[in-house]
Interface confidence: medium
């Protein structure tokens, strides 16, 4: 998971946008990636980075046999 996220985050050169990606990786099953992205006011580049990293991280976790993760964070 870490390697894949680092690979995606490397595409985003701007530090603020890179942070948006890392914010998206945080586990949070209280809301979907789309719900969380909809509240981002920084700008479209941040929304794109957040959403891509959030979706990829969630799908990787889902494929990792649904281990008992700390959901909701």
């Amino acid at each position: 998971l870490q390697e894949k996220i680092e690979e995606i985050a490397a595409k985003y050169k701007h530090l603020v946008v890179k942070k948006c990606c890392y914010d998206g990786v945080r586990i949070n099953h209280d809301e979907t990636c789309e719900q969380r992205a909809a509240r981002i006011s920084v700008g479209p580049r941040c929304v794109k980075a957040f959403t891509e990293c959030c979706v990829v991280a969630s799908q990787l976790r889902a494929n990792n046999s649904h281990k008992d993760l700390q959901l909701g964070r």
């Epitope: 209280d30 990636c33 719900q35 509240r39 979706v55 799908q59 008992d68 909701g72 964070r73």
Partner: antibody
Framework: EVQLVESGGGLVQPGGSLKVSCAAS????????MQWVRQAPGKGPEWVGL??????????EYAASVKGRFTISRDDSKSIVYLQMSSLKIEDTAVYYC??????????WGQGVLVTVSS | DIVLTQTPLSLAVSPGEPASISCRSS???????????LDWYLQKPGQSPQILIY???NRASGVPDRFSGRGSGTDFTLKITKVEAEDVGVYYC?????????FGQGTKLEIK
Amino acid sequence: EVQLVESGGGLVQPGGSLKVSCAASGFIFSDYYMQWVRQAPGKGPEWVGLIRKKVNGGTTEYAASVKGRFTISRDDSKSIVYLQMSSLKIEDTAVYYCVSRAGPPGLTWGQGVLVTVSS
Amino acid sequence: DIVLTQTPLSLAVSPGEPASISCRSSQSLLASDGYTYLDWYLQKPGQSPQILIYGGSNRASGVPDRFSGRGSGTDFTLKITKVEAEDVGVYYCLQHRALPPTFGQGTKLEIK
């Protein structure tokens, strides 16, 4: 182990106000959204609202049935979430549960606190 | 709001027999993040609800393996392979795909 303990329930007249509290332990409170769910006697659970963690703005969302009358707040320093209820109606009579997705997957529920609105 | 329709609303099963509860959603509960935002809870008499299944099909820690969840998108099923006396109570499905989270009406399981 995640624990949620509600307090402050009781009998209140229609139009009155009441504030219930939920003390949380066993997890890093500031890292999690907190929610309230209620259950009227003999009925199924109904979501009341949530408060996001500060990192996500600490903002709130409410069910249409309580919007404008109920307010959720949190005190991260004390690991407590509050539900302030005003302009109470008879149909607000219910057991109010504090819930969270802290700890194991799924919602963890408190024991609930009974709020009775009656004249 | 997303509407969850549970069937049946009540169920009487003999010990050792199977039981099945359906939960149908008015919208897909599978999000683009790959997670299915559907849980199953059991509320035993006089108690708070307790988690059985999360993510549509993942058994929560400590839940006996006679409980299983299946389904995707809009149609979900909770199965109990062999019902035991301690399984009595009301079963609820819950969606948290969209705000507000909504519950099914509940299915009351009784022992014959």
